[in-house]
Interface confidence: low
C-alpha cells in the first residue's frame, strides 16, 4: 500500500459525507446504498464511522460531473478516467467525483428494478437465458400481452424467477391518472397514437393518454424510461431498442454486433432497420458504483494507489463479486487509523434494499405507488398544445427537403431558435433548419432535417448556441439541454444540472460574455454561464432590462451574430451593440427582410 506524502489523514473519526447530486443511471436508493456499503467496507476494519449529512460542510462531498466539472481536473468522456478523489483535508480535499459520462451500474449491466412477477422486486439479471437464448435487455418473448419482462437470475429456464420491467403498458408516472397504464391507441389533437409521444410538449418527455381519448378526458401519464434498452449514440440516442427488429432480412430479439467490425452491441429503434435505418448502441455492463466508490473513498481517507494487482486500491477497475478489500488495503488503512477497537462485525450485506412487491401474480391493474426515480424537476402539468402531426418522414441524411412555400425560410414568421454556428447563421423551426451566409447574394439554404444532423434532438428548440473555443453546440428545449461535440452528444440533461432552478422553464437565448463564458436568458432573467464547468453562477442572476435597456421584455430568442446581440420578439429583432461597456439598441428590423435579405414581395 501507499499513503499520500506526509500520511494525510482525517484527525477525527466521525467522518461525514454529503451526496451533492445523482447520476440518472441508477435509482437514487441504489446510489445511496452503494455509497453506504462502500463506506461500510472501511468502517468495518477501522475505528472510523461515516454519517450522511445534507450540507456542503461535510468532510467528503460526493458529486457526479462530466468533462470539466469545476475542479480543474476534467473527466474524459466515457471509459478511461472513471472517478477521482482528493486526499483528506479542508475544502475540496476529501471530496470524491464520479464521471457521469460512464454508465453507472452495479457492474453487471444496467439496473432495472422489476415489479410483480415472482422475484419480490429484484433487479433484472443481464444477460439471462430464456428458452436457450441469451437476452441482454427486457423482452416480450414468450408473452402475448406485450409486457416486457426479464429474468432476475442468469437462467430463467432453470430458476424460473422473473419480474416485469418498467413499461407504459404496466404503469405511468406522475401526470394526473394515478399511475394507470397507457391506453393504445389514443386520440390527441385529433390524431391517433399507438405509442408514447413527445408531441405537444417542448421538454422532450414521453407521455401517453390513459384513456382512449385525451382530447375528451385529459388524463395522461409519463412513460417510464427503460435503462436496459435506451440506446446511446448512433442516430437515435435516448430512444428505446425495439425487439424484435429486422436487420438484413433477419429478425433479432436482442442486441447484436452483426454488421459491425468492432464487436459493439447495437439495436434498431424501430421494428425494421432495413427500411428505417434508425439505431443506437446498447448499454454495456457499466461500472460498479459500489466498487469504484469504495476505491475513491480509500483515496478520500488517505490511501494512494497500491501496487498489488488484487487490491481494491490498485489503479485499474476490475469487477468482482467477492469481498473487495484485500489484506494490503486493510494494512494501509490501519496504518493511518489503527484497527477497529471492538470485534469486527459481519461484513455488510451486499443486496440493495428493494421495495415490497405486490402479490406474485401477473398484473391485472397498475400499481398505485409512484416510483421514486422520477426526476424532481419533471413535468407535472398536462401536455401543452404543440405540433399536431408526427415528425416529417425523411431520409436519414442531411438531404434538402423538397421546397414548398412553407419550406422557404422567407415564409417563416417566427423561428424557434437562431444561432451563429461557424460563420453561418442557422435558423431552426419545427424539426427543420436553414443555413444562411451573409453577402453571398443567396437565399437561406435548406430546409434540412434537424434529425439528420443532430439525431438526438427534439423537433422544437428554444435556443441554440455554439461555444467558439470548444466548438460545443448547446441545444435547449424546455427543461432539457443537449450538448454536441462533433458527432457525439451529451444529453438530454435537465437544466438543474446546469444550476438553473426548477422555476426556469426554458432557456430562451445565449450571448458570449468573455472567454469561455456566456449569458443565458430565460424570459426577463439572465445568468452568467461557465461553459467549461457547464454551470451557471446563481449569484449572477440579473434582470434583462437592467443590462440591455430598450429591448422588449418578452423576447422568445436571444442570439449573437457578427458580434452583435439580437433580441427577437414576434417577427422582429432588436439589435444591440456594445460600446464602452454600454449596451445600446442600434437597429430594429425584420428577421426575414433585414437579416436574411428576403425580397419584400
Amino acid at each position: 500500500f501507499q499513503t499520500f506524502e506526509g500520511d494525510l489523514k482525517w484527525h477525527h473519526h466521525n467522518i461525514t459525507y454529503w451526496i451533492q447530486n445523482y447520476s440518472e443511471d441508477l435509482p437514487r436508493a441504489v446510489i445511496d446504498d452503494a455509497f453506504a456499503r462502500a463506506f461500510a467496507l472501511w468502517s468495518a476494519v477501522t475505528p472510523l464511522t461515516f454519517t450522511r449529512v445534507y450540507s456542503r460542510d461535510a468532510d467528503i462531498v460526493i458529486q457526479f460531473g462530466v468533462a470539466e466539472h469545476g475542479d480543474g481536473y476534467p473527466f474524459d468522456g466515457k471509459d478511461g478516467l472513471l472517478a477521482h478523489a482528493f486526499p483528506p483535508g479542508p475544502g475540496i480535499q476529501g471530496d470524491a467525483h464520479f464521471d457521469d459520462d460512464e454508465l453507472w451500474s452495479l457492474g453487471k449491466g444496467v439496473v432495472v428494478p422489476t415489479r410483480f412477477g415472482n422475484a419480490d422486486g429484484a433487479a433484472c439479471h443481464f444477460p439471462f437465458i430464456f428458452e436457450g437464448r441469451s437476452y441482454s435487455a427486457c423482452t416480450t418473448d414468450g408473452r402475448s400481452d406485450g409486457l416486457p419482462w426479464c429474468s432476475t437470475t442468469a437462467n430463467y429456464d432453470t430458476d424460473d424467477r422473473f419480474g416485469f420491467c418498467p413499461s407504459e403498458r404496466l404503469y405511468t408516472q406522475d401526470g394526473n391518472a394515478d399511475g394507470k397504464p397507457c391506453q393504445f391507441p389514443f386520440i390527441f389533437q385529433g390524431q391517433s397514437y399507438s405509442a408514447c409521444t413527445t408531441d405537444g410538449r417542448s421538454d422532450g418527455y414521453r407521455w401517453c393518454a390513459t384513456t382512449a381519448n385525451y382530447d375528451r378526458d385529459k388524463l395522461f401519464g409519463f412513460c417510464p424510461t427503460r435503462a436496459d434498452s435506451t440506446v446511446m449514440g448512433g442516430n437515435s440516442a435516448g430512444e428505446l431498442c425495439v425487439f424484435p427488429f429486422t436487420f438484413l432480412g433477419k429478425e433479432y430479439s436482442t442486441c447484436t454486433s452483426e454488421g459491425r467490425g468492432d464487436g459493439r452491441l447495437w439495436c434498431a429503434t424501430t421494428s425494421n432497420f432495413d427500411s428505417d435505418k434508425k439505431w443506437g448502441f446498447c448499454p454495456d455492463q457499466g461500472y460498479s458504483l459500489f466498487l469504484v466508490a469504495a476505491h475513491e473513498f480509500g483515496h478520500a481517507l488517505g490511501l494512494d494507489h497500491s501496487s498489488v494487482p488484487e487490491a481494491l486500491m490498485y489503479p485499474m477497475y476490475r469487477f468482482t463479486e467477492g469481498p473487495p478489500l484485500h489484506k494490503d488495503d486493510v494494512n494501509g488503512i490501519r496504518h493511518l487509523y489503527g484497527p477497529r477497537p471492538e470485534p469486527e462485525p459481519r461484513p455488510p450485506t451486499t443486496t440493495t434494499p428493494q421495495p415490497t412487491a405486490p402479490p406474485t401474480v401477473c398484473p391485472t391493474g397498475p400499481p398505485t405507488v409512484h416510483p421514486s426515480e422520477r426526476p424532481t424537476a419533471g413535468p407535472t402539468g398536462p401536455p401543452s398544445a404543440g405540433p399536431t402531426g408526427p415528425p416529417t418522414a425523411g431520409p436519414s441524411t442531411a438531404t434538402t427537403v423538397p421546397l414548398s412555400p412553407v419550406d422557404d425560410a422567407c415564409n417563416v414568421n417566427i423561428f424557434d431558435a437562431i444561432a451563429e454556428i461557424g460563420n453561418q447563421l442557422y435558423l431552426f423551426k419545427d424539426g427543420k433548419y436553414w443555413r444562411f451566409s451573409e453577402g453571398r447574394g443567396s437565399r437561406p439554404q435548406g430546409p434540412f432535417l434537424i434529425a439528420d444532423k443532430w439525431p438526438a434532438l427534439p423537433r422544437k428548440l428554444d435556443s441554440v448556441f455554439e461555444e467558439r473555443l470548444s466548438k460545443k453546440l448547446f441545444f435547449f428545449s424546455g427543461r432539457q439541454v443537449w450538448v454536441y461535440t462533433g458527432a457525439s452528444v451529451l444529453g438530454p440533461r435537465r437544466l438543474d444540472k446546469l444550476g438553473l432552478g426548477a422555476d426556469v422553464a426554458q432557456v430562451t437565448g445565449a450571448l458570449r460574455s468573455g472567454r469561455g463564458k456566456m449569458l443565458l436568458f430565460s424570459g426577463r432573467r439572465l445568468w452568467r454561464f461557465d461553459v467549461k464547468a457547464q454551470m451557471v453562477d446563481p449569484r449572477s442572476a440579473s434582470e434583462v432590462d437592467r443590462m440591455f435597456p430598450g429591448v422588449p421584455l418578452d423576447t422568445h430568442d436571444v442570439f449573437q451574430y457578427r458580434e452583435k446581440a439580437y433580441f427577437c420578439q414576434d417577427r422582429f429583432y432588436w439589435r444591440v451593440s456594445s460600446r464602452s461597456e454600454l449596451n445600446q439598441v442600434d437597429q430594429v428590423g425584420y428577421v426575414t427582410y433585414d437579416i436574411l435579405q428576403c425580397p419584400e414581395d
Epitope: R264, K277, T397, L469, K471
Partner: antibody, heavy 116, light 108 residues
Framework: QVQLVESGAEVKKPGASVKVSCKAS????????ISWVRQAPGQGLEWMGW????????NYAQKLQGRVTMTTDTSTNTAHMELRSLRSDDTAVYYC?????????WGQGTTVTVSS | QAVLTQPPSTSGTPGQRVTISCSGS????????VNWYQQLPGTAPKLLIY???HRPSGVPDRFSGSNSWNTATLTISRVEVGDEGDYYC?????????FGGGTKVTVL
C-alpha cells in the same frame, strides 16, 4: 496566412518511438482541434486521432489506442504526436490538419521511415 | 481496409462531367455529414467539400457534393487537366473519423 508547419523527416528502428510536431500560425490556435492523419506509401489516408487545442481532450483511433499520444503546447501554438513501439508498417507520411467542420488546413507532412 | 467504399479510379476528358461515389452505412454516412478531400500528386490533401455540399472559399463551383441515404457523391461538372489526382471522402463513424479508400481521377 493560416498555416501548419511540421517537423522534419525521421528514420527509426522497430520498437522505437517518434514524436512529430506541428506549429500553427495565422489563426487562434485554441479555437480549433488538430487531427493527425497518416498515409503509407501508395496507400490512402488513415485517421489517427484528434486533440482539442482548447482543453487537451483527445480522441484516438481504436487501432492505435495505447501507442499514440497527442498533446498541445498553447504557449508555442504547437501540436505534438508521439507514436511508440514502431513497426515497419508505421512507415508513412504523417500529416497534422486543423479540424473544424472539416480538415481545412494541412501541414506539409512528415515522412517517418521505420527500418531495421 | 477502408470503412467507406469508393471506386478505385475514374476518368474523363476535359469539360466532361465526372462523379465519384462514396458508400458507407447508416453508422457513418447515414447519420453524419461527409467531407471530400483532393490530393494532387506529391502534395498534402486539401479540403474540397465540407458538410456534404459546402465549398470552402477558393474552391471552384465546378465541384459539388451531395449525400443521400448511405451514399455521398462528389461531382466535377467540367473536369480540367489540373484536377488529376486522388479524391477521398471522409465521415464520422460513432466517435471515429473514417476515410474512403480514395479514387484516382485521370483526365484523358
Amino acid at each position: 496566412q493560416v498555416q501548419l508547419v511540421e517537423s522534419g523527416a525521421e528514420v527509426k528502428k522497430p520498437g522505437a518511438s517518434v514524436k512529430v510536431s506541428c506549429k500553427a500560425s495565422g489563426y487562434t490556435f485554441t479555437s480549433y482541434g488538430i487531427s493527425w492523419v497518416r498515409q503509407a506509401p501508395g496507400q490512402g489516408l488513415e485517421w489517427m486521432g484528434w486533440i482539442s487545442a482548447y482543453n487537451g481532450n483527445t480522441n484516438y483511433a481504436q487501432k492505435l489506442q495505447g501507442r499514440v499520444t497527442m498533446t498541445t503546447d498553447t504557449s508555442t501554438n504547437t501540436a505534438h504526436m508521439e507514436l511508440r513501439s514502431l513497426r515497419s508498417d508505421d512507415t508513412a507520411v504523417y500529416y497534422c490538419a486543423r479540424d473544424y467542420y472539416g480538415m481545412d488546413v494541412w501541414g506539409q507532412g512528415t515522412t517517418v521511415t521505420v527500418s531495421s | 481496409q477502408a470503412v467507406l467504399t469508393q471506386p478505385p479510379s475514374t476518368s474523363g476528358t476535359p469539360g466532361q462531367r465526372v462523379t465519384i461515389s462514396c458508400s458507407g452505412s447508416t453508422f457513418n454516412i447515414g447519420s453524419n455529414t461527409v467531407n471530400w478531400y483532393q490530393q494532387l500528386p506529391g502534395t498534402a490533401p486539401k479540403l474540397l467539400i465540407y458538410s456534404d455540399s459546402h465549398r470552402p472559399s477558393g474552391v471552384p463551383d465546378r465541384f459539388s457534393g451531395s449525400n443521400s441515404w448511405n451514399t455521398a457523391t462528389l461531382t466535377i461538372s467540367r473536369v480540367e487537366v489540373g484536377d488529376e489526382g486522388d479524391y477521398y471522402c471522409q465521415a464520422w463513424d460513432s466517435s471515429a473519423v473514417v476515410f474512403g479508400g480514395g479514387t484516382k481521377v485521370t483526365v484523358l
